[in-house]
Every structure is written in C-alpha cells, then in structure tokens.
C-alpha cells in the first residue's frame, strides 16, 4: 500500500496473509466463510500457509493469530494467465477458524460498486514503488471507486465488467504484495486487489480490482459443492 497508514488493530479481522516457507508473504487474502478464503487467482501456489489474526508483517507470535494450511485452491474457471479477467480464487482451509475479535469472516457484496463509493483497501505489500519497502504492520488506505469509463481511459481495451478501478489522489495505491487482499465498501467485501500500472501510484493510473459482485453465485455454489 503506497501512502496508506497503519490499520487500527482488530479492524480487519478478515485479512489473511498467504505465506511461503519460511514465513514469506506473497499475497493477501480474505476470510469469507469459517473455512474459506478468497484471493486473486494470480496468487495461486502449490504449497502455502495461511495466517489470520496477525497485525505485523514479521513472524513474531501474536496472541490473536491462527495458522492454517491451504488444502484446496479453486481458481475461477474463467481466469486465464496472463489475462486479468475473473481474477479470483477460493482457498479451503484445513480446518474451520475459531471466531474471535481478530479472526472473523466478511460478507461478499452482491451489489456492484457505484462511482464515488468510498472503500478501504489493506495489505502488507510494498509501501514504495518501483523500490520495494515492506511495512512493519498491516496498512490501510481509503480509495474511491471510479467509473468504468475512467478505468477504460486509463487502461484501454483491458477492462471488463469483472474488474473495477479505484484510487485516490496520485501517490496513493495498492501495490505488489497486496494482491488478493480486500477492498471493503460499506462494511462488505467489494473487491480483491488484482492489478495496476507499474510503478504503482502513478497519476491517472488507478488500481484495478476484481469486481466480486459478479461472482457471488459462483462463490456460494463452489463453497457448497466443496464443503
């Protein structure tokens, strides 16, 4: 997250970190069910661990943390690398979470976002770009949803209705390492960090997010079929 600020503790209990050994974060994710996460399809790895209820990036033990294995990864069938469409994936945890103030699922919004809607994006991704500098603790940033037309102007021929753009002033954006993390609008999960320009936070180059309102049926049906 570029030019965000430290999230208040306990305010993002659905935020998950996807880790490679040894405790190396490579993507964010979101708890949407007691045993299921959503993340970006481009975050797919064969073997990984999931950390929930953790505030700092470092592997230091925190009393609210819960650790899991990802036992099943189900990318959306419409996702095709290196395209950006349908960039979402469900991850089944090896067991159900223990609900606490630090670990709690969030509902996926069935309403599509309106231009101007204020949202919050969070993650442990780099705080500088093109340099790489990772934060000590989870970062939060207020962003506004942009119209599809503004999005199309910024990224011609690359935008479809499985994506939405959001941004703030130049110099504020999600970035590498935030992928798969949540965009929360009006208390519901509206999007996942998907892609954007490089370097991050360039003027008139907003972040692009997976438009989850288009996938509520697929999410529900996939969880039910694999539970």
């Amino acid at each position: 997250i570029i030019n965000g600020s430290d999230c208040d503790m306990h305010t993002q209990p659905w935020q998950a970190a996807l880790l490679l050994r040894p405790n190396q974060l490579y993507c964010g994710a979101v708890l949407v069910h007691p045993q299921w996460l959503l993340t970006a399809a481009h975050c797919r790895k064969k073997v990984f661990r999931v950390r929930l209820g953790h505030y700092s990036l470092s592997p230091v033990y925190e009393s609210g943390q819960q650790m899991f294995q990802g036992v099943k990864s189900i990318p959306h069938p419409g996702y095709s690398h290196p395209g950006h469409s349908n960039d979402l994936m469900l991850i089944k945890l090896n067991r159900r979470i223990r609900p606490t103030k630090d670990v709690r699922p969030i509902n996926v919004s069935s309403h599509c976002p309106s231009a101007g809607t204020k949202c919050l994006v969070s993650g442990w991704g780099t705080t500088k770009s093109p340099q790489v500098h990772f934060p000590k603790v989870l970062q939060c940033l207020n962003i506004s949803v942009l119209s599809q037309k503004r999005c199309e102007d910024a990224y011609p021929r690359q935008i479809d209705d499985t994506m939405f753009c959001a941004g703030d002033k130049a110099g504020r954006d999600s970035c590498q390492g935030d992928s798969g993390g949540p965009v929360v609008c009006n208390g519901s999960l509206q999007g996942l960090v998907s892609w954007g320009d490089y370097p991050c936070a360039r003027p008139n180059r907003p972040g692009v997010y997976t438009n989850l309102c288009k996938f509520t049926k697929w999410i529900q049906e996939t969880i039910q079929a694999n539970s």
């Epitope: 309106s114 231009a115 037309k149 199309e152 102007d153 011609p156 479809d160």
Partner: antibody
C-alpha cells in the same frame, strides 16, 4: 467543435466525416460521435479516448464504424461503411468532459447525411 | 449494459407549473448522469452533469437529483422557452453499450 459537410450518399457507400476542434486539446478531452435520425432520439455511435486515442463503439456500430484522430491537425474522423437508408441522420461531433463525469459539454451544429438510391 | 429508460415519453404542463422527468439505469452508474435540452433544429445543450450540478448559465429552475440507478430532472416555474425534448445520458461506461442516451421526453408548455 464543427463537423465537415454531410450530403447525399447511396446505399453501400462509405461515409467519412471529419470533426475539427479548436480551443482545447484532443489529448485532454475525448470526442464522441452522436447521430439523430429525423424525428428520432439521440443515438451514440462511439468515442475516442483522450490520452491514448483508443476508440470504443456502440454495440450496433462496432462492425462498420471507425473513429480516428490526428492530434496535430486537431481533427477526429468518423468512417462508417455499408450505408443504408437507416443511416440517414444528422451527425454530431461532441466533446466529452471527464471533469464533468464525461458529460457532453460542447456540441457541433451537426451535419445532415442522407442515404438514398 | 447500462441502458437508460426515460419516462414519460411526453408531458404537458402549464406555464408556471412543474414537470418531472425520470431516467432509470439498468445498472448502477453512481452519479455519472447528465441531462440535455434540445430544441427543434438545434444541437442538444448540457443542462446538468454528475446528476445534480447545474451547467454554466442554466437557470436554477432546472434541478437534477438521484444516484445509482434512479435519476430525476425537475423543471419548476415552467416558461414557454422550456418547450423542448430532454435527454439523459450516462458517462459511466462505454464498453458493450447500445446507447448512452435515454429515449427522450418531449415537454409541451401550454
């Protein structure tokens, strides 16, 4: 913004209209083409983006319309192939204002295109 | 996608009266909606942009409201000069769009 002269065309002809702009940069404002058949409502044909000059079209117009621009000459061109009588209309070149939520804030006077055998 | 349905197709009101024109989007377009007035033989003129902001030189008798999918143009203290056709248009998306304009509403002033 001002459109070039329309005129009388035959079915199957190709229409080429040029819009000349002054007082602003095509790199800052998108340009749309809109048409209006006699006694009918406004019909959007397509537009060309400001920064990259990429064109988007209405679904009905996509297969036979091309919008291009020349930023040095301050012109935007609409080319429409395979004309039929249904293409008879007044064609407007319009400036879109991104600051105003892409409202159409400057309209040309329009040019009449008649398609008849 | 993002089709606009404008109602009514025609409305008649007396001088000094009020008319209300509705525009409904098939999907949420935030506040990216504008209103236009067109008189016979002339190009349309921008009245209101971003749902409720009055364009320069437009009298305050014209009022736009709404957001998301439902929008309204209200013309109060009607004058003879307000007799025209009014159109709404969306500026939210241009991909896979049939028409960005509503069908139009003819306002007749008695």
């Amino acid at each position: 913004v001002k459109e070039s002269e329309g005129g009388l065309f035959k079915p199957t002809d190709t229409l080429t209209l040029t819009c000349t702009v002054s007082g602003f940069s095509l790199s800052s404002y998108p340009i749309s083409w809109v048409r209006q058949a006699p006694g009918n409502g406004l019909e959007w044909i397509g537009y060309i983006t400001s920064e990259y000059g990429v064109a988007y079209y209405a679904t009905w117009a996509e297969s036979r319309s091309t919008i291009t621009r020349n930023t040095n000459l301050n012109t935007v061109t609409l080319k429409m192939t395979s004309l039929t009588a249904a293409d008879t209309a007044t064609y407007f070149c319009v400036r879109e204002n991104p600051t105003y939520g892409y409202a159409y804030d400057a309209w040309g006077p329009g040019t009449l295109v008649t398609v008849s055998s | 996608a993002y089709d606009l349905t404008q109602t009514p197709a025609s409305v008649e009101a007396a001088v000094g009266g009020t008319v209300t024109i509705n525009c409904q989007a098939s999907e949420s377009i935030g506040n990216e909606l504008s209103w236009y007035q067109q008189k016979s033989g002339q190009p349309p003129k921008l009245l209101i942009y971003q749902a409720s902001t009055l364009a320069s030189g437009v009298p305050s008798r014209f009022k736009g409201s709404g957001s998301g999918t439902d929008f309204t143009l209200t013309i109060s203290d009607l004058e003879c000069a307000d007799a025209a056709t009014y159109y709404c248009a969306q500026g939210f998306s241009s991909s896979g769009v049939e028409n960005v304009f509503g069908g139009g509403t003819e306002v007749v002033v008695k």
